[in-house]
Each structure stands twice: as structure tokens, then as C-alpha cells.
Amino acid sequence: PSGLVTANITDSEALARWQPAIATVDSYVISYTGEKVPEITRTVSGNTVEYALTDLEPATEYTLRIFAEKGPQKSSTITAKFTTDLDSPRDLTATEVQSETALLTWRPPRASVTGYLLVYESVDGTVKEVIVGPDTTSYSLADLSPSTHYTAKIQALNGPLRSNMIQTIFTTIGLLYPFPKDCSQAMLNGDTTSGLYTIYLNGDKAEALEVFCDMTSDGGGWIVFLRRKNGRENFYQNWKAYAAGFGDRREEFWLGLDNLNKITAQGQYELRVDLRDHGETAFAVYDKFSVGDAKTRYKLKVEGYSGTAGDSMAYHNGRSFSTFDKDTDSAITNCALSYKGAFWYRNCHRVNLMGRYGDNNHSQGVNWFHWKGHEHSIQFAEMKLRPSNFRNLEGRRKRA
């Protein structure tokens, strides 16, 4: 073979391409190795002219070799060198956001770095850049403007190599969050009464959404996204209805999967479930909660249980949402159809909070298995979410 080149190089992948041998060959043997990286050898068909190299180490110079085989004969080896990109830092987060200061934190990339370039920019176009040392994983921003949206970006540096930038968006506080993105921000604005509020997805005034805020449970700041209390609302609804939401926010309702996706895409959220039945109460909190977009069929992530109701959501973690007209569960039967509800079903449920109100038949009702089992329909249930770092925000607000 000849003309060995690499293309589409990222921090973990590259595409090797070559001109085929003039003679017909049985196979090509490709090997690649880098400093401190064991050699990997792969054999591919003789009519192949490219090969995807995967699981590469970032910021590493690799030597790529290829030769052709035909029977016992081997061609001469051709060689190419390439260097993988520097991988990006991860999880850039703005915390301790005050009116004029904020703390940026991040996780380092896998590759060693010689420093980081931090860029932060306000909506009025003011840009500041700072280079920090390789062992730094946080940086305090000062002299910010109050009530201002900022975009902070960070890029890892290693000599001439520069990673892709990652970014986070935050808003410095004034007296109020002008466009609260969730109920926690509404609460930090001083609103402490449970009820209907307008939030702005991603703090965008064009993305207004009316929600019910629970401002009392465990410190408040919760967006309620499901309530069951009397059986007046029909929860045996189709995919379109569950995507959009339905019901009366003051009564029984479902906020909508599209809204949940947009809210949980704003940052790290926690889930709280409150249950009541004949004077008994129970709760479950999950410190990581998110809902994917429509392409993932609103895939659920729920981790980090604490509470008194029992960890019934663990069974549903990683599942896509199912309704009677869109069956995404792992059962042969349609769980939503079988149990007259909708949920992130598996095969089928530990939790069925959108089940038939008051139905005590096995698995048909409003169930939370590890509290009341599958043969008792719970009288009152709410699911709600707020940022995982709410406690920190609340504490700082009180100090301020």
C-alpha cells in the first residue's frame, strides 16, 4: 500500500486511509502505538482502504504502520505519524454566583496540560481572558456586572495544542433574577409562597413557562411536574399529550416531557417525590435527575436515592418513556397498555404514578412499590425537581 494518511483526528479517534496495493491482496495489517500506549494490531480485508482508530489517548503522538499480506507474503511497511487532539476539560460550572463575583470550577482533561485559557463574556460584548496554571481546577471571577448573563469558556493548553472549548452560562444576581429559569431562582428572588409562577427556560424571556412552585417542602424551590390527588384528570393519555403536558397546574397535571427535558438540560437537577396516603407520608429524593430529548424518547436518568419511600425509581433508570401508542419498554407486552398509564416503563414497573387513580388491582393503580406495593393505589403523589446545588444557593442568599 502507499499514501498512508490520517484524517478526522479528534482526542480519541482518527481515520487511517491509504492507497491500495497494486496487486490483489488478502488483507492489510494495521498497527498503531503511542508513547506509554501499548501497540494495537488489527487485520482488515484486502479491499479496505480506510480504518477507524478508536479509544485513542488524547494529546499523544501515534505511529501508524500498515502492510499488505497475500498468503505467506508480506509487503513492505508504510508508516505515518499523527497526534491526537488535546481533550477538553469537563463539567465547567459556575457556582457561588453573586452580583459581582462567581466561582468557575472544572474537571481536568485526561491529557496532561500546561495551562488553561479562560474566556468570559457578558451579553454587552465585554470579553476578558485569563490563563491559569495546569493544576488549577477553579477560578474566581471578580468585577462582574450585576444582573448580567455571562458565557464562560475554557480551553486546555499543552504547548501548541489547544482543546475544544467548553462553556457554561450564568447570570450574576441583582436584587432579583430578572428571568428565573426555575422555582429555585424564583424563591431566591424572595417568592416564598407555593403557587403558580412564570419561569424562563435557560433564562430566556422568550421561553416563558407557567409552573407550580412548591416553596415549602424541604426548603422549597421545587418545580412540581406531576400531581395526583383526586382522580379527576385522565392520565391514560397518548405520546403527544405526555410530550406537551396536560391538566390544571393547581390540581392534577403533568408538566410535559419536552418541558422536563428543557429544564433538566439547564444544569444538574434533583428529583423529589412526595407521597401521602391515609395520613401516612413518605418521600424519595434522587440527587441526579434528568430527562433526555425526544430523540432519546425522553430517556430517564435518576440516581442517588435517599428518603423513606424506598428506592423504587432505580428500576426505571436509563429507560425511555412509554405510552400506549408509543411502546419503548423492554417487555413483549405494551406496559402502558397493560397498566393503563404512562411512565419510563421497563418490564414493567416499580413506580406507576401515572396509573389509574384509586385502582387497587395488581400494578394498575398509583403505585410506589417499595412503600405500598402494587396492590394499593396511593391517594396523593407529587414529583418535583430543583437544582442539586439549591442548598448552597439558599445558604449564600441568606448570608447575602
Epitope: A314, G318, A331, I332, R346, N347, C348, H349
Partner: antibody, heavy 120, light 107 residues
Amino acid sequence: QVQLVESGGGLVQPGRSLRLSCAASGFTFDDYAMHWVRQAPGKGLEWVSGISGSGGSTYYADSVKGRFTISRDNAKNSLYLQMNSLRAEDTALYYCAKGTRGEGDTFDIWGQGTMVTVSS
Amino acid sequence: DIQMTQSPSSLSASVGDRVTITCRASQYIQGFLNWYQQKPGKAPKLLIYDASNLETGVPSRFSGSGSGTDFTLTISSLQPEDFATYYCQQSYSTPQTFGQGTKVDIK
């Protein structure tokens, strides 16, 4: 690759104690529930005990409750079963098993087992 | 505790046969059922989880079905390496319980 290796089995007299260990490798140990399942010679499988990924929750079969204690050391990727007041009916091959993600009550990886014989 | 009853307890079959093993739970367990294969002197191996889902790496001739209380494991065309003992297990509630096993041997 994912691997579980049990140790600590042996011959023990009734009423005495034994501690089984299971060394895990190839996966993020503290993400998964772990279990002990036993099989008496020529018999079927019997679940003995389980423990959550954090170690905060433990579960036991009635036949061993109060006598056996399951524990884990996530720093060492190790699972343990402390067996006290052993009886002849505890004689079995003891398997360590990894739970799947989520509830962890399905066993997707098993060790090769360690034999416990309780006899005078 | 939930009792799991398998039938038959043993069966003889030839290579290429279609084999069906049933498992019945003493109470309703939705689809919280798993199937394992155990060969002599070896640890059990997970075949099917959640009643009908094939574990990664398990040949497609194995399939599972059922929900509620009645479940079936089917081997569409028995292969020499399939002669073993098969166990069902409910993961619906603690204690997780196994069926008594079905031994599949050569006719």
C-alpha cells in the same frame, strides 16, 4: 474483563464461624449491588444475601438471618460473608454474584464458587 | 416468599429439537423474571432478563416470554452445548427465589 473470585471456604464444625471473601475486578464495584447465592450438593440455587452498592442496605434469606452478615469494602473491591453458628444445612457451594444496574436483583456475573462443608 | 415452580424437572431431547421450559410464580410478578443456564461444575450464566430480554452474547435461539405468573424459556433448535440445567428466578421481591431447575439431557 469482569471477574469475581471467591475464597475462604473449607471444612468447619457445626456452631463455628467462617468468613467468605469475593474479589471483584473489571467494573466499577460501588455502582452495583452484590449478592451471595449458594447451591447445596446436587440441589438447586438459593439466594442467601444481598447488599447495595454503597453498602447502606443489606438483605438476607430467612434461613440465614441473624447468623450471616454481608458487607463490602468498596476501596478494596471486595465483598464478604461472615457466617456464624454454622449448621450442616449450610453446606453448599457459595457463589458471589454481581447485580445488574438499577435494582441489582438480576445476577449477570458469577464467580466460580467456594465450597463450605459443615460437619463434625 | 414467592414460590417458583418449573416444569418439567427434566427432559430428554435431541440436537435440533425445539425445547420449551415453563416457570410459574405463586403470585403476580409482572415481568420480573430471569433465566439462567448452569453446566455441571460451572457457575450459572444469565440468559434472559426481564422475562424476554436476551443477555448480551447469548445466542438468539434462546427466547423468553410471559408476564404475570406464567413464563416460558424456549430453545428453538437445541445445540450440543445447550445440554445443561436451566433455572428461572424472580427478581420482583426479596428474597429473590429460584425455580428448582430443569435438566435438559441428550435423548
